[in-house]
Interface confidence: medium
Amino acid sequence: YNVFPRTLKWSKMNLTYRIVNYTPDMTHSEVEKAFKKAFKVWSDVTPLNFTRLHDGIADIMISFGIKEHGDFYPFDGPSGLLAHAFPPGPNYGGDAHFDDDETWTSSSKGYNLFLVAAHEFGHSLGLDHSKDPGALMFPIYTYTGKSHFMLPDDDVQGIQSLYGPGDEDPNPKHPKTPDKCDPSLSLDAITSLRGETMIFKDRFFWRLHPQQVDAELFLTKSFWPELPNRIDAAYEHPSHDLIFIFRGRKFWALNGYDILEGYPKKISELGLPKEVKKISAAVHFEDTGKTLLFSGNQVWRYDDTNHIMDKDYPRLIEEDFPGIGDKVDAVYEKNGYIYFFNGPIQFEYSIWSNRIVRVMPANSILWC
């Protein structure tokens, strides 16, 4: 997190806000609900209280405007700048302005007013942008999904550094951004994508360029807004320029940033029995056109060329790949070796000699 220079903050805990005007995109009650919910994000974790005024001067004046709207910080038409807010202080201090050239919504379409407002009110209270891609105060808008919003830990630490904690946090679970060098780090899925490596963990993935040590961290939804926050397994089919992503009983085919029509499909359409609830890991072999799909202590082999499950499967993981354990969290193949991830450990398995050749920490893939 980051606070503004000179640690700008309000010197009182009871703050007022006023909605000066409304966007035509939403009903008045939807707008009011979005702003109330956005203030609650911050009051839930601090001693701050927010009261709405219907007229007069409030600490935080909220308005919608376009282009030059009276503060010498003009908006720029659709997309680009969405909104801005002033840090705590008199006059403009704390005020939040929203660009009415955007389409404001209470859903994933256009820009979600609650999410943008919660971010802007962070500025109104004294938080600057964060470098943590998981933080609400990260400067890039990402719709985080329909489920109940949880304020990330980085933002909680930031706002409590200014105002301290509240009496009781109604939602004490604040998602932390994974630390790639945490020795207990386990991974959810790994796939190549157009020469890069994508390493998935929780609602994030690390993007590793070849010959590069520093992996970039992204929210999965910043790449693929339609995907679930978390995924179970992934593999690339390079000759078709596709990657396949699995979550629960569904899977998606993606070409770059775009989901193919007809997806998601059910994993049962691949020939998996109905009792398989999820795929835990998947890896594709371009030379044979086969894909291994792991679930529980079993492995299936799918023929991507003929679109059928191979006979004699499922088989036990321990029988086909002795020594790697009875589950696989994530897997990928490179230069004749399969890398199996099981908890905080990865096994380098030689396809040629059919045995484990190295055991390493899972996060050594991230150069830790």
Epitope: T142, N255, G256, Y257, D258, L260
Partner: nanobody
Framework: EVQLVESGGGSVQPGGSLRLSCAAS????????MNWYRQAPGKQREFVAG???????NYAVSVRGRFTISRDNSEGTGYLQMNSLRPEDTAVYYC????????WGLGTLVTVSS
């Protein structure tokens, strides 16, 4: 419906630069990812670079560090700045919006030779 028209192709010597443009008609361009693909004579069409709606970029390994993709939603235009061109970059370059099942331009020829 989005129509795409590429321009900016031509002949250039190795080490030279070109800037390809992709003009989109239709106001929905900003709702789609924008990609460049290329096809060399006798070869399969291959991905070159992509930029998401949220302006996240992605490059083929062979062009990373030399090519830069960008977009201007207000103008409805996408760009591919190609520097340090090599003979193996010779191909017809196609603009795409929305991925393999999306919209395609007719292509513009880039020739790199001495």
């Amino acid at each position: 419906e989005v129509q795409l028209v590429e321009s900016g192709g031509g002949s250039v010597q190795p080490g030279g630069s070109l800037r390809l443009s992709c003009a989109a008609s239709g106001s929905t361009f900003s709702r789609y990812s924008m990609n460049w693909y290329r096809q060399a004579p006798g070869k399969q069409r291959e991905f070159v670079a992509g930029i998401s709606v949220g302006r996240i970029t992605n490059y083929a390994v062979s062009v990373r560090g030399r090519f830069t993709i960008s977009r201007d939603n207000s103008e409805g235009t996408g760009y591919l700045q190609m520097n340090s061109l090599r003979p193996e970059d010779t191909a017809v370059y196609y603009c795409n919006a929305g991925g393999l099942q999306g919209y395609w331009g007719l292509g513009t020829l880039v020739t790199v030779s001495s």
